[in-house]
């Protein structure tokens, strides 16, 4: 989690900075959304608790050809300790409903803002 260099600076990025940058990117996506995000692609919703970052990546990585979320996918990979590939789902990822990417991003953003306010950067 401390090796998140490359987003804003050349060296290791503090977790608080990395989280803030992820939040800023999600805000940017939601504010600049003109047409439906990723053509209305649907992804598995996730439980916003333990293993959230990996679960979010596992869900979003399946969407290809959507430039709007490519940076988010890269950022989330920095928070996830293991390599995630398309079609891969951990035991933490319960597949019970699919939602549009736009809603997924909004839900994730709200939760990350809450974590940031509470000082939970890891």
């Amino acid at each position: 989690l401390t090796c998140l260099g490359g987003f804003a600076s050349p060296g290791p990025v503090p977790p608080s900075t990395a989280l803030r940058e992820l939040i800023e990117e999600l805000v940017n996506i939601t504010q600049n959304q003109k047409a439906p995000l990723c053509n209305g692609s649907m992804v598995w919703s996730i439980n916003l608790t333990a293993g959230m970052y990996c679960a979010a990546l596992e869900s979003l990585i399946n969407v290809s050809g959507c430039s709007a979320i490519e940076k988010t996918q890269r950022m989330l990979s920095g928070f996830c300790p293991h390599k995630v590939s398309a079609g891969q789902f951990s035991s933490l990822h319960v597949r019970d409903t699919k939602i549009e990417v736009a809603q997924f991003v909004k839900d994730l953003l709200l939760h990350l803002k809450k974590l940031f306010r509470e000082g939970q950067f890891n």
């Epitope: 439906p36 990723c38 053509n39 209305g40 692609s41 649907m42 992804v43 399946n62 969407v63 290809s64 050809g65 959507c66 079609g87």
Partner: nanobody, 116 residues
Framework: EVQLLESGGGLVQPGGSLRLSCAAS????????MDWVRQAPGKGREWVST????????YYADSVRGRFTISRDNSKNMLYLQMNGLRAEDTAVYYC?????????WGQGTLVTVSS
């Protein structure tokens, strides 16, 4: 080019059944997870069901679980949705979709109307 053509919709009474079909072409069907998505009049898109590439694993929205059954025939590049115990709230245009690609590749859909 990805093409998806849905059929099988119609007017049915509450409690009735319909079987929707979707003919797929332009991609390697047996490698792709497939979805059924619906859109009720004046409402947003709602995920209905998903089936794994080989058809071994299926997933359903709570609203249709136990009533709808998704299946596929990879030899024919066909996707199906058997709908039993239909309710008024199931009235919608139903689309089949190549998972994770969005409505860029949706067909025209097939209208299901549940009414007495």
């Amino acid at each position: 080019e990805v093409q998806l053509l849905e059929s099988g919709g119609g007017l049915v009474q509450p409690g009735g059944s319909l079987r929707l079909s979707c003919a797929a072409s332009g991609f390697t069907f047996d490698r792709e997870e497939m979805d059924w998505v619906r859109q009720a009049p004046g409402k947003g898109r709602e995920w209905v069901s998903t089936i794994s590439p080989r058809g071994r694993t299926t997933y359903y929205a709570d609203s249709v679980r136990g009533r709808f059954t998704i299946s596929r025939d990879n030899s024919k590049n066909m996707l199906y949705l058997q709908m039993n115990g239909l309710r008024a709230e199931d009235t919608a245009v139903y689309y089949c979709a190549k998972a994770y690609t969005g409505f860029k590749y949706w067909g025209q859909g097939t209208l299901v109307t549940v009414s007495s």
